[in-house]
C-alpha cells in the first residue's frame, strides 16, 4: 500500500506535462494576495529640523491580487532533467479588500533624496545634489499616492540630475509587464528528492551579492518542496524579493481544511547577528550601520538594488535589535501578525498555505552638504511599508487533495 502511494506521489510531483504538480506549478490554482501597510510619517518637520524620532502610523491594508499569471517560456531540458521558466509579475488592485484607494496620500521618506545622497558620497557632488534638491523643491520627506509609491513616479529632483539616471522611482518599479528569472529548476524525473530545487537563477548558481555561502541559491522557490517532508528538516528556499536564500523550521501540526499540514516558520535565528549565529557573518556587509555586525534583524540589500540603501526586515522590526527600532516611534511587532510561515502538505511537499511578510526600509544618513539632511544627528533605517503576501488552497482544490492524496493514505 505505502509503496504504491509513494510511487504514485513520486510520479505526480514531477514537473512535466500531465502531472498534478505541473498543472498547478505552471499557473497557481490558489488566489494570492499582497497586502500593503504604509508607514505614514506624522512629524516630518521635527525629524528634519531636530533629528527627532520618526513617528509613524501604519495605514492599510491596501490589497493587490498577484501571481495570477502563468509561468512563461517553460522549457524542459531532458539532458539535465531541468525545466526553465520566467515568473511574470502582475498586480491588480482589490478595492473591496482595501481600506482606501490607490490615490490615497502618504507622507514618506523622499526615496530619491535618501538614495542619491547614499550613492553619491563625494562631498562636491553632494553640493550639486543639494542645489538640485532645492531647485526641485524636494525635501527629506514627500507626499505620494499609494500608486506612485509602489509602482513609480517621475521624481522632480532626479529629473534635474545631469547624469544618465533613471528618473522614475517606486518601491516596486518596474513591476507590471516584467518577469522574475530565468529560473532553472530540477523537474525530478531522475531524482524526485531534487524536484523544484533551483539549479540556476538568471543563468548562475550564485547571486554575486554576498560573500561565501550567503551567496548561494539554495532550495526551491517555497511554492513546493521535494515530497515526504520530515519535521526534522530545515527547508531551504530562495526569495528574489530579499535577494537571498533563507530557511524555515518546523513549528507545529496544523489542520488546513481537513488536510494535515506542517507549519514551517522562519526562525529568529535566521535574522540574528553573527555574534549569535556565526553563519550569518556574510550577510553583514558593512561595519558602521551594523555597529560592527552586532545589530540584527535588518538586511542590507543595496548591492542587489543598484546601490540604493534598501534594508529588508520583518514587519515592525520583529526580531530586530533595539538600536534599529529605537529612532522610530509607533511600531508594535508581534509574531502572530508579522512572522513568515509556510503550511506544507508533507507527502507531496506542496505549500498549501503561506504568509510571506517583509518590510521595506530605506537608510537615510546625515549630510553636511545637503541642507535637508544636515540637521540629522544620526542614521535612520526608515520603514516605508510592510507587506503580507498570502495564499490558501481553495475549498474545491482542498476537497480534491483530500480525496486523492490524504484520504488515500489515511
Amino acid at each position: 500500500g505505502d509503496l504504491l502511494i509513494q510511487k504514485t506521489i513520486k510520479k505526480q510531483v514531477v514537473l512535466e506535462e500531465g502531472t498534478i504538480a505541473f498543472k498547478n506549478w505552471v499557473k497557481t490554482g490558489t488566489e494570492v494576495y499582497r497586502q500593503f501597510w504604509i508607514f505614514d510619517v506624522q512629524n516630518p518637520q521635527e525629524v528634519m529640523m531636530n533629528s527627532s524620532n520618526i513617528q509613524v502610523k501604519q495605514r492599510g491594508p491596501y490589497t493587490y491580487r498577484v501571481r495570477f499569471l502563468a509561468k512563461e517560456n517553460v522549457t524542459q531540458d531532458a539532458e539535465d532533467n531541468t525545466v526553465s521558466f520566467l515568473q511574470p509579475n502582475g498586480a491588480i488592485f482589490e478595492p473591496s479588500l482595501s481600506v482606501g484607494t490607490e490615490a490615497d496620500n502618504f507622507t514618506v521618506l523622499n526615496l530619491a533624496v535618501a538614495a542619491a545622497s547614499h550613492i553619491y558620497q563625494n562631498q562636491f557632488v553632494q553640493m550639486i545634489l543639494n542645489s538640485l534638491i532645492n531647485k526641485s523643491k524636494s525635501s527629506m520627506f514627500q507626499v505620494r499616492t499609494l500608486r506612485e509609491l509602489l509602482w513609480g513616479y517621475r521624481d522632480p529632483f532626479l529629473s534635474l540630475v545631469p547624469y544618465p539616471v533613471t528618473t522614475t522611482v517606486g518601491l516596486f518599479y518596474p513591476y507590471n509587464n516584467t518577469a522574475d528569472g530565468v529560473y532553472k529548476v530540477f523537474n525530478g524525473k531522475d531524482n524526485i528528492s531534487k524536484v523544484a530545487i533551483i539549479d540556476t537563477y538568471k543563468g548562475k548558481r550564485n547571486l554575486s551579492y554576498w560573500e561565501s555561502h550567503c551567496d548561494m541559491i539554495n532550495g526551491t522557490d517555497a511554492a513546493s518542496f521535494p515530497p515526504f517532508v520530515e519535521k526534522s528538516q530545515v527547508l531551504q528556499f530562495f526569495s528574489s524579493d530579499i535577494c537571498r536564500s533563507i530557511y524555515a523550521v518546523f513549528e507545529s501540526d496544523v489542520n488546513l481544511k481537513g488536510i494535515p499540514v506542517y507549519r514551517f516558520v522562519l526562525p529568529s535565528k535566521a535574522f540574528a547577528s553573527p555574534v549569535e549565529n556565526p553563519d550569518n557573518y556574510c550577510f553583514c556587509t558593512e561595519k558602521i550601520i551594523s555597529k560592527n555586525c552586532t545589530s540584527y534583524g535588518v538586511l542590507d540589500i543595496s548591492k542587489c538594488k543598484e546601490g540604493r540603501p534598501v534594508y529588508i526586515s520583518l514587519p515592525h522590526f520583529l526580531y530586530a535589535s533595539p538600536d534599529v527600532s529605537e529612532p522610530i516611534d509607533g511600531l508594535n511587532p508581534n509574531e502572530e501578525e508579522h512572522r513568515t510561515y509556510l503550511d506544507i502538505e508533507p507527502i507531496t511537499g506542496f505549500t498549501l498555505q503561506f504568509a510571506k511578510r517583509l518590510q521595506v526600509n530605506l537608510l537615510v544618513k546625515p549630510s553636511e552638504k545637503i541642507q535637508v539632511l544636515k540637521n540629522l544627528k544620526r542614521n535612520y533605517i526608515v520603514p516605508i511599508l510592510w507587506l503580507n503576501e498570502t495564499g490558501t488552497i481553495g475549498d474545491e482544490k482542498a476537497n480534491m487533495f483530500r480525496s486523492q492524496v490524504t484520504g488515500k493514505i489515511n
Partner: antibody, heavy 116, light 107 residues
Amino acid sequence: EVQLQQSGAELVKPGASVKLSCKASGYTFTSYWMHWVKQRPGQGLEWIGEIDPSDSHANYNQKFKGKATLTVDKSSSTAYMQLSSLTSEDSAVYYCAPIYYGLDNWGQGTTLTVSS
Amino acid sequence: DIVLTQSQKFMSTSVGDRVSVTCKASQNVGTNVAWYQQKPGQSPKALIYSASYRYSGVPDRFTGSGSGTDFTLTISNVQPEDLAEYFCQQYNSYPLTFGGGTKLEIK
C-alpha cells in the same frame, strides 16, 4: 538667470584687512553653496573655501585658514570674504561661484592689490 | 593635497585642427574632474564635469575623457574663439585643486 555682482577693485596697504562682496541674484541665494577662488596674475586657480548660506557653515582650504573668513547676509543675498593681515602674496583676483551643476557660474572677479 | 599637473603651459594650433590638453593627477581621482576655459580678461567658464560630460551650451567640439589619474580635454575643429587658457580641476577630495593651466594659441 544666475548673476553674481562682485565689489570693485581694492588697493590696500600691507597688514590691513579687506572685505570683498558678492551679490547674488536670479536664484534662491540660500539654496546653493558659495565657493571662493583666488587667481594670482599669470598663475593658476586656488580654492579658498565654501559656505552654506542657509546656516553660514563654512569649510576652508587649510592654506587659507586664519587668512580668509567667509560670511553671508541672507537678507541682501550677499556673500562676503574678509582677508586679514594682507601681504603682497594676497594680491590677486578673487572669484565667487555658487555650486549648481558644479562651479558653472562665476562672478566677474574682484582685483585686490596689496601695496604700500 | 592632490596635485594636478598640466605639463604643457602653452600649445599652438591652427583653426580647424584638433588639439588635446592633458592633465595628470598625483593620485586616483576617479572621474571627479572638471575643465574650465578662461579667455583673456574674463572669468573661468565651466566646460566639462565628471571628466566627460559637457555642460549645457558647450559646443560639442569640446570632449573630455579619462579616469583615475590621466585626463584629456580634446578640442576638435579649433575655432578662433577657442583662444584661451584651459584649467582642469579635481573634486575627488578636499581641498579642491586646479591644474596650472594650458594656454592655447591660434597660429
